[in-house]
């Protein structure tokens, strides 16, 4: 399977909410011995590999923001911790999963990564991720609402497997 990032760039005004999205592509095994661990983190554009470094989002680590479920089940973070930080991650039945960030500030600008780990029988793991940029703007040049820029087909199916 692969992870697609429908949008590679989100440009938002300060104070706005934004939902960053990734999508699981390809065949997804729905067997009872297969589960999915999905999460989000910030990173930097490394020289070797994007999304290699895992930094917190608003002080919450990728562990704090995880979703864990079987197949194409729906899930969302019910953590009070995440919601207190204006964050919520969610997943639907169609392979889409997202993180919503409320009341954006300039400090939220940066590279965001979604991570999916497919776990088979608890000892085989297949890891893929996607990356997207968030730019939060202020002042007269800032858009009135978030503007999203679609990924090229090559970018949107970027895959890194463990």
């Amino acid at each position: 399977f692969k992870v697609a990032t429908p949008y590679s760039l989100y440009v938002c005004p300060e104070g706005q909410n934004v939902t960053l999205t990734c999508r699981l592509l390809g065949p997804v095994d729905k067997g009872h011995d297969v589960t999915f661990y999905k999460t989000w983190y910030r990173s930097s554009r490394g020289e070797v590999q994007t999304c290699s470094e895992r930094r917190p989002i608003r002080n919450l680590t990728f562990q704090d923001l995880h979703l864990h479920h079987g197949g194409h089940q729906a899930a969302n973070t019910s953590h009070d911790l995440a919601q207190r930080h204006g964050l919520e991650s969610a997943s639907d039945h169609h392979g889409n999963f997202s993180i919503t960030m409320r009341n954006l500030t300039l400090l939220d600008s940066g590279l965001y990564c979604c991570l999916v780990v497919e776990i088979r029988h608890h000892h085989s793991e297949h890891r893929v991720h996607g990356a997207m940029e968030l730019q939060v703007q202020t002042g007269k040049d800032a858009p009135s609402n978030c503007v999203v820029y679609p990924s090229s087909s090559q970018d949107s199916e970027n895959i890194t497997a463990a």
Partner: antibody
Framework: EVQLQQSGPELVKPGASMKISCKAS????????MNWVKQSHVKNLEWIGL????????SYNQKFKGKATLTVDKSSSTAYMELLSLTSEDSAVYYC???????????WGQGTSVTVSS | QIVLTQSPAIMSASPGEKVTMTCSAS?????MYWYQQKPGSSPRLLIY???NLASGVPLRFSGSGSGTSYSLTISRMEAEDAATYYC?????????FGSGTKLEIK
């Protein structure tokens, strides 16, 4: 604060069985696997196996199948490892450690020393 | 199973000296992880995904490598770095550790 609190040292007789506990606090227990690691003077660090509190699924190092049994109690956020038919070769320090999927064992218990002697 | 061979088994370094230790895998692995252990303490995660520092790890530590060859480097040795260092792989079941490199201070 993330903590993994293991049960105290044990002195047991050959042939006996025993259970070590690892109480987790400060994090979402079901979002991680709980791993168990053996450290002896002979073999350094050996991965015994893991259990997923999310669904109770386990995975064992073949070497420890029949020797170790892993269980969890979600209600108390506690992982257990039972060691069976103990021999002197099982004398070691045993650690529990949490691991997020696609990551590493980032927090470890303080270790439980097990001595098998008659 | 994948065997991880660490070298040297024992080494010593003076304060301020650069230290490099290696971990060789019997088969290719995707990522390497490094742990530090001091006597009487539990292992501590140092490096994840080959080259990334775990939370709270000093910047003098770095990791690199790919395939079957990995290394851990301390740019300037400090007294508190005296410990045993273990590499570990999650790529193939069963998950294995190296035999360790004991680093002593001169």
């Amino acid at each position: 604060e993330v903590q993994l609190q293991q049960s105290g040292p044990e002195l047991v007789k050959p042939g006996a069985s025993m259970k070590i506990s690892c109480k987790a606090s400060g994090f979402s227990f079901t979002g991680y696997t709980m791993n168990w690691v053996k450290q002896s003077h002979v073999k350094n660090l050996e991965w015994i196996g893991l259990i997923s509190p999310y669904d109770g699924g386990t995975s064992y190092n073949q070497k420890f199948k029949g020797k170790a049994t892993l269980t969890v109690d979600k209600s108390s956020s506690t992982a257990y490892m039972e060691l069976l038919s103990l021999t002197s070769e099982d004398s070691a320090v045993y650690y529990c450690a949490r691991r997020a999927y696609g990551y590493a064992m980032d927090y470890w218990g303080q270790g439980t020393s097990v001595t098998v002697s008659s | 199973q994948i065997v991880l061979t660490q070298s040297p088994a024992i080494m010593s370094a003076s304060p301020g000296e650069k230290v490099t230790m290696t971990c060789s895998a019997s088969s290719s692995v995707s990522y390497m992880y490094w742990y530090q252990q001091k006597p009487g303490s539990s292992p501590r995660l140092l490096i994840y995904d080959t080259s990334n520092l775990a939370s709270g790890v000093p910047l003098r530590f770095s990791g690199s490598g790919s395939g079957t060859s990995y290394s851990l480097t301390i740019s300037r040795m400090e007294a508190e770095d005296a410990a045993t260092y273990y590499c570990q792989q999650w790529s193939s079941y069963p998950f294995t550790f190296g035999s360790g490199t004991k680093l002593e201070i001169k």
